[in-house]
Structures are given as C-alpha cells and as structure tokens.
C-alpha cells in the first residue's frame, strides 16, 4: 500500500516537472512572439517613413554604414527606453561587432561625455544569459564586464568604452538603431 | 481628435515650486505619449517630460532630472508636472501635448500652453 502511494507521488511530481518545463517553453515562445511582432511594426514603420525621405537616416541621427543612431539627451528606465526607440521604428541598440562598438563609442566621446547609455541588451531572469533583443546572444567579446550584484532585472549600458550592467529600473540615456535606406541610385 | 488644457502656471519665486495640470479629452491617448514642452522667449521649443499613456513609461529631459515628477491619473485622465527647486531659467511657456514619438520633439495636438515665471 505504502510503496503504491510513493509511485503515485514519483509519478505525480514527474508530471509537475513537465507541466512547469512546458510552461517555461510556453513563455519563451510567448516573449520571442512579442519581440517578432515589435520588430515587425518597428520595420514597417520605418519602410513607410522612409518612403517619404531621400536621405539614409532621419534629422539627428547618425549614420554607420548600414545603421542609423539616435543618441538620446532624454533618461529613462530600460523598458521606457526600449518603448521611445521603437515607438521611432527603431530598437535599442544592437552591438554586432568590435567595430560597431568603437564607432559608437568614438562617437559618444565626441558628442558628450563619459554617461551611461542604455542598449537592447538584457539577462535571462531563468538562465542568466545575456541576450539581445531579438533573442540573440553576444559574442564572447561584447558581453557586460562588470556582473551587477542587484537581485532585479540586469540590463545592459554603454559607458566610454565599456560594455556594463546595471538594474533595469535606473535611469539613464540609451542609444536607437534602425537600418540606413539604400539610396536609389 | 484630442483636446489638452493646461493649467497651473503663474508666477513663483526661484526655489519655489508649482504643479501643472494637463486635461486631455477626445479620443483615447493610448497610442500616445503626453509631454510637457516648454519655450523661452527666442529659444526653440523644448521636452521637459513625456508618459507613454498606454505602459505608463516616463522619460525627462536632462533640465527637469531631480526636481521635476510627471505623473497621472487615469480616472481623470489627466498629467501633471510637479516642478521644485525653480530658476529663473525655468521662465517658459508651457505646452501639454500628445505625441506618437517622444524623440522627435514634435506633436500631433498641442495645449494652449501656460505661462510659468520664475523671479529671482
């Protein structure tokens, strides 16, 4: 009697186990999801202004290559960031390679000074891996220095030439980016 | 259409404080941002502060960090700017908008504005 009771235990804790892995799949589809379709509205925003424009990037944004930059003088948290860049049909920053990272941080020394700003970097609440936010991961060489010691959200910023982290919920300047058009030649 | 009536400006001393009232009434403001710009006499105008109405998200420009609070009530449907420590620089009108972007420094419908003067 005993021993049929603990089975049904083992096998009932079993299925918890997989209906709690199910659900966390279930979230992460759900996360990756809403992240497609803000991209999706993001890039349709920004083929239908560009429409109306001749020139590679908007008024007050930089232009590297294939990319535009919005360099903010506005403070927000992470998430309010993420919201003004892809409310412009942009999204937070997106750090693909050391050349990337030295154009936008030859840039910052020439516009401002040594502040904090906020890109589309964040960690994993479940594995703490660092992820983009079109889900991707950092190369080994673009990953946070500095491990936050906060027990919230960490998220990633740029500062002079480092790549840090910090609790999502302070304030700081952030970086947009969206893609250059290509002139019609 | 939305329609904004700011309220609350006047005339305050340097280090005083005032509280500006954006009433907001129309269509929903949920796919909008409602910001606080201001202008100077022979200056260009300025964002002092923004609310993202659907997420509730806040942004401030670099002269409101610290002594300015946006907040709202959604009941009334209403934005207010709490604004302490004030300078004579802070002298401007103010202008309640609804804006689809915050960064671009434009609007699709504006308030009427208010004066705010600070004496030193």
């Known amino acids: 009697k005993l021993l049929q009771v603990s089975t049904i235990a083992m096998q009932q804790q079993e299925k918890l186990i997989q209906q709690e892995r199910a659900l966390l799949n279930f979230t992460e589809w759900k996360r990756s999801c809403a992240l497609q379709m803000k991209y999706c509205q993001a890039f349709m925003q920004n083929s239908l202004s560009s429409a109306h424009n001749s020139s590679p990037c908007p008024n007050n944004w930089i232009q590297n290559r294939e990319s535009c930059y919005y360099v903010s003088e506005i403070w927000s948290i992470w998430h309010t960031s993420q919201e003004n860049c892809l409310k412009e049909g942009s999204t937070l920053l997106q750090i693909e390679s050391k050349e990337e990272m030295d154009f936008i941080t030859g840039s910052l020394r020439k516009i401002k000074g040594s502040y904090d700003y906020w890109v589309g970097l964040s960690q994993d609440g479940h594995s703490g891996r660092w992820l983009w936010q079109d889900g991707s991961s950092p190369s080994p060489g673009l990953l946070p220095a500095e491990r936050s010691q906060s027990a919230n959200q960490v998220c990633g910023y740029v500062k002079s030439n480092s790549l840090l982290s910090s609790n999502c919920s302070t304030w700081k300047y952030f970086i947009c980016e969206k893609y250059a058009l290509r002139s019609s030649v | 259409q939305v329609q904004l009536q700011e309220s609350g400006g006047g005339l305050v001393q340097a280090g005083g404080s005032l509280r500006l009232s954006c009433a907001a009434s129309g269509r929903t403001l949920s796919n909008y941002a409602v910001a606080w710009f201001r202008q100077a006499p022979g200056k260009q105008r300025e964002l002092v502060a923004a609310?993202?109405?659907?997420?509730?998200?806040?942004s401030y420009a670099n002269s409101a960090k610290g002594r300015f609070v946006l907040s709202r009530d959604n009941a009334k449907n209403t934005v207010y700017l709490q604004m302490d420590s004030l300078k004579p620089e802070d002298t401007a009108v103010y202008y309640c908008?609804?804006?689809?972007?915050?960064?671009?420094?434009?609007?699709?419908?504006w308030g009427q504005g208010t004066q705010v003067t600070v004496s030193s």
């Open positions: 609310i993202w109405w659907a997420s509730g998200g806040i």
């Open positions: 908008a609804a804006a689809s972007s915050v960064l671009s420094g434009t609007a699709d419908y």
